[in-house]
C-alpha cells in the first residue's frame, strides 16, 4: 500500500517522498499523463504500469499491506504474504531503486509540476 511505498522510497533514496516525489513531473504521484519529463518521471510511469497490471489481476494495490526487510541498502520482499502482496512489494522495490539510480538527474523544478503542461503521447504499458 501507500504506507509501504512511502517508507521504502525514503529508506532507499534518503528523500522524503511527500516532499520530493509526490508529486514530481507528469507521473509521480496520483494519476499521470503525457510524456515523462525525465528519467525519474519514467520510473513513476513504469511503476504506474506495474500497478495497472496488478489491478487487472484483482489486487487491491492501495489497501494491501506487505512485509519486507531493508538491510545494508537492499530490500527483501517477504515470501510469506499472498501473491498480490509479493507482487506489490516487487513493484515498489523496482520504483524505489529506479528513483535512487536517477538521483543525479533529479530536477527541483519538476517538483509540483503543473500537470496541464504534461503534453504528448502517454507511453503505453
Amino acid at each position: 500500500g501507500i504506507l509501504n511505498l512511502n517508507k521504502m522510497v525514503k529508506q532507499v533514496t534518503g528523500k522524503m517522498p511527500i516532499l520530493s516525489y509526490w508529486p514530481y513531473g507528469c507521473h509521480c504521484g496520483l494519476g499521470g499523463r503525457g510524456q515523462p519529463k525525465d528519467a525519474t518521471d519514467w520510473c513513476c510511469q513504469t511503476h504506474d504500469c506495474c500497478y495497472d497490471h496488478l489491478k487487472t489481476q484483482g489486487c487491491s494495490i492501495y489497501k494491501d499491506y506487505y512485509r519486507y526487510n531493508f538491510s545494508q541498502g537492499n530490500i527483501h520482499c517477504s515470501d510469506k504474504g499472498s501473491w498480490c502482496e509479493q507482487q506489490l512489494c516487487a513493484c515498489d522495490k523496482e520504483v524505489a531503486f529506479c528513483l535512487k539510480r536517477n538521483l543525479d538527474t533529479y530536477q527541483k523544478r519538476l517538483r509540483f509540476y503543473w500537470r496541464p503542461h504534461c503534453r504528448g503521447q502517454t507511453p503505453g504499458c
Epitope: 487487472t56 489481476q57 484483482g58 489486487c59 494491501d64 515470501d79 499472498s82 501473491w83 502482496e85
Partner: antibody, heavy 120, light 106 residues
C-alpha cells in the same frame, strides 16, 4: 519424512479458551520462508483458514476471527500453538495444522486433525 | 475477501466417466490449488499452481483455468477418486477455500 500432529482438549464449555498444540517433525520452523497454519472443518462442512505463523515469528490471522485468535510457536520443541478465546458451539470442528513451504501459496503437508466439541 | 464457489456441490460418476469440477472466484486470481479429502482423513494437496499434479496423483487428473474460472478434471473416473475436492486461493489475503465438491461413485 514430514509429519504434523494436533492435540487439544477434546471437549470444553462455551466461553472457555480453546488451546491447541501442533507438534511437527521432518522440518524446522527456523528455515527461511517456512510457515505453519491452522485450518478447521466443522463436521460435514468445508475448510476455514484460521492463522499462520512463520519462521521469523510473523503472524497472519483470518480477519473474521482475528480478535479471538492467538498463534505462537516454540521452535526448540518443534511446536505451534493456537488459542481461541470465548468459544461457542460454532467452534465445534476438526482442527488441522499444516505446513506452508517456502515460496508456496498452499499447504503441502497436513496433520491428521484433532476433534474439538464445544458444549453449551 | 475472495469467495470461491464450487460446482456442483455433490455429483456422482460411473467408472470410466469424465468428471469436471468447477471453482469460480469472485475476483481474478493468479493460481488455484486443489485438495482431495476422503472421509475420516485430512485433506491432501492434489493440484498446485492451477495445473501441476502433487506427488503421487494419478495422471488422469488435470487442472486448468485462469482469471475467475478454474477446474479440476478426471479423464476417466475410478473408484478411488470418490472423495471431496476443495479449491483454495492465496492470491490475496485472507487465504480462502471453496465449500467443496463431493464426488461419489455411481
Amino acid at each position: 519424512q514430514v509429519t504434523l500432529k494436533e492435540s487439544g482438549p477434546g471437549i470444553l464449555q462455551s466461553s472457555q479458551t480453546l488451546s491447541l498444540t501442533c507438534s511437527f517433525s521432518g522440518f524446522s520452523l527456523t528455515t527461511s520462508g517456512m510457515g505453519v497454519g491452522w485450518i478447521r472443518q466443522p463436521s460435514g462442512k468445508g475448510l476455514e483458514w484460521l492463522a499462520h505463523i512463520y519462521w521469523d515469528d510473523d503472524k497472519r490471522y483470518n480477519p473474521s476471527l482475528k480478535s479471538r485468535l492467538t498463534i505462537s510457536k516454540d521452535t526448540s520443541r518443534n511446536q505451534v500453538f493456537l488459542k481461541i478465546t470465548s468459544v461457542d458451539t460454532t467452534d465445534t470442528a476438526t482442527y488441522y495444522c499444516a505446513r506452508r513451504g517456502p515460496g508456496t501459496w498452499y499447504f503441502d503437508v497436513w496433520g491428521t486433525g484433532t476433534t474439538v466439541t464445544v458444549s453449551s | 475477501q475472495i469467495v470461491l464457489t464450487q460446482s456442483p456441490a455433490i455429483m456422482s460418476a460411473s467408472p470410466g466417466e469424465k468428471v469436471t469440477i468447477s471453482c469460480s472466484a469472485s475476483s481474478s486470481v493468479s493460481y488455484m490449488y486443489w485438495y482431495q479429502q476422503k472421509p475420516g482423513s485430512s485433506p491432501k494437496p492434489w493440484i498446485y499452481r492451477t495445473s501441476n499434479l502433487a506427488s503421487g496423483v494419478p495422471a488422469r487428473f488435470s487442472g486448468s483455468g485462469s482469471g475467475t474460472s478454474y477446474s479440476l478434471t478426471i479423464s476417466s473416473m475410478e473408484a478411488e477418486d470418490a472423495a471431496a475436492y476443495y479449491c483454495q486461493q492465496y492470491h490475496s489475503s485472507p487465504l480462502t477455500f471453496g465449500a467443496g465438491t463431493k464426488l461419489e461413485l455411481k
